[in-house]
């Protein structure tokens, strides 16, 4: 029969024959022969391969360097890499999460729209009319102005995006 020019899924072509790829978590030791199957070995401790492969080396698990603010979010296996995330108050600088930066704070006049996570920074939004923020914070949302009316008071000083309204007593009408 004609030697194959293409192989099935999870196979590879070598020496005019189709050999089985090694399964995830294993590396190649020796190609198959016409008499024997591909010889594979499991990846070692702290190594992985996440696809059907013909690699002769396994990949090293990622190291979550605490000096860069990183910690392990999910321990790697022979088939998956370690997933790193950042320590509390920090977030990754990239999708690969190779280093961390401190969460951004929202300045006065801005509130937190979305609190930062290990992988995303704080999202700030300007305080709309009727709301204010007088602190620099990574957690505080814009607060609504105090409603003087509900306290039976009147506005003595208008609020801004950075300050609350100041309420005061109503002027008494003299009889």
């Amino acid at each position: 029969p004609e030697p194959p020019t293409a192989c099935r899924e999870k196979q590879y072509l070598i020496n005019s024959q189709c050999c089985s790829l090694c399964q995830p978590g294993q590396k190649l030791v020796s190609d198959c022969t016409e008499f024997t199957e591909t010889e594979c070995l499991p990846c070692g401790e702290s190594e992985f391969l996440d696809t059907w492969n013909r690699e002769t080396h396994c990949h090293q698990h990622k190291y979550c360097d605490p000096n860069l603010g990183l910690r392990v979010q999910q321990k790697g296996t022979s088939e998956t890499d370690t997933i790193c995330t950042c320590e509390e108050g920090w977030h990754c600088t990239s999708e690969a999460c190779e280093s961390c930066v401190l969460h951004r704070s929202c300045s006065p006049g801005f509130g937190v729209k979305q609190i930062a996570t290990g992988v995303s920074d704080t999202i700030c939004e300007p305080c709309p009319v009727g709301f204010f923020s007088n602190v620099s914070s990574a957690f505080e949302k814009c607060h609504p102005w105090t409603s003087c009316e509900t306290k039976d008071l009147v506005v003595q000083q208008a609020g801004t995006n950075k300050t609350d309204v100041v309420c005061g007593p109503q002027d008494r009408l003299r009889a």
Epitope: V29, S30, E37, E39, L41, T56
Partner: antibody, heavy 112, light 109 residues
């Protein structure tokens, strides 16, 4: 196929290098094991070199034997400080624990 | 280092009979075990790998079983041509080393 060469008559304390020459497959995706057999005795595993270049040895062989790839088709077994116990037929074979292709062997005789 | 203990050292069988050879590993090796047949003046020939898989071309009268530390090679319906020495070989799953059993001489009467 695989074939060993470099055997012969050697003196104790000599250093010798055996060569395993392969054809029909690539050392970039296949491991090579070395095994020896003293006259009338059983098989004795010496060591292995993987496609990656990583090597492992039997505990008794560490420090006395060195396996290395010397070209895209050859693997050497270097033996230092030969003793008369080194008298054996030395085989190379493709693989780790699926040794289908073996060479015919090369005889090493160590005698004073 | 792993140690493979093979028994018996020698066994005789009549043509058509059955031979059983055992191999014990000093620690668990899963199914990373092979059996070889060797005749005088020849290199070993692979009979079984992964404890129970026969390479194509090896007669079906040869079979292997076992996992962990205990393994068996069985020759059913022994033929004259089966007279040889048989060796087991076990290896660490890490790839860090293997060892052969001491061998079993099979004499066919």
């Amino acid at each position: 196929s695989v074939k060993e060469s470099g055997g012969g008559l050697f003196k104790p304390t000599d250093t010798l290098t055996l060569t395993c020459t392969v054809s029909g497959f690539s050392l970039s995706s296949n491991a090579i094991s070395w095994v020896r057999q003293a006259p009338g005795k059983g098989l004795e595993w010496i060591g292995i070199i993987y496609a990656s270049g990583d090597t492992y040895y039997a505990s008794w062989a560490k420090g006395r034997f060195t396996i290395s790839k010397t070209s895209s088709t050859t693997v050497d077994l270097k033996m230092t400080s030969l003793t008369t116990e080194g008298t054996a037929t030395y085989f190379c074979a493709r693989g780790y624990t699926t040794l289908y292709f073996w060479g015919p062997g090369t005889l090493v005789t160590v005698s004073s | 280092q792993i140690v493979m203990t093979q028994t018996p050292a020698s066994v005789s069988a009549a043509v058509g009979g059955t031979v059983t050879i055992k191999c014990q590993a000093s620690e668990s090796i899963s199914t990373r075990l092979a059996w070889y047949q060797q005749k005088p003046g020849q290199p070993p020939k692979l009979l079984i790998y992964s404890a129970s898989t026969l390479p194509s071309g090896v007669p079906s009268r040869f079979s292997g079983s076992g996992s962990g530390t205990d393994f068996t090679l069985t020759i059913s319906g022994v033929q004259c041509d089966d007279a040889a020495t048989y060796y087991c070989q076990g290896g660490y799953s890490s790839g860090a080393g293997t060892a052969f059993g001491g061998g079993t001489e099979v004499v066919v009467k």
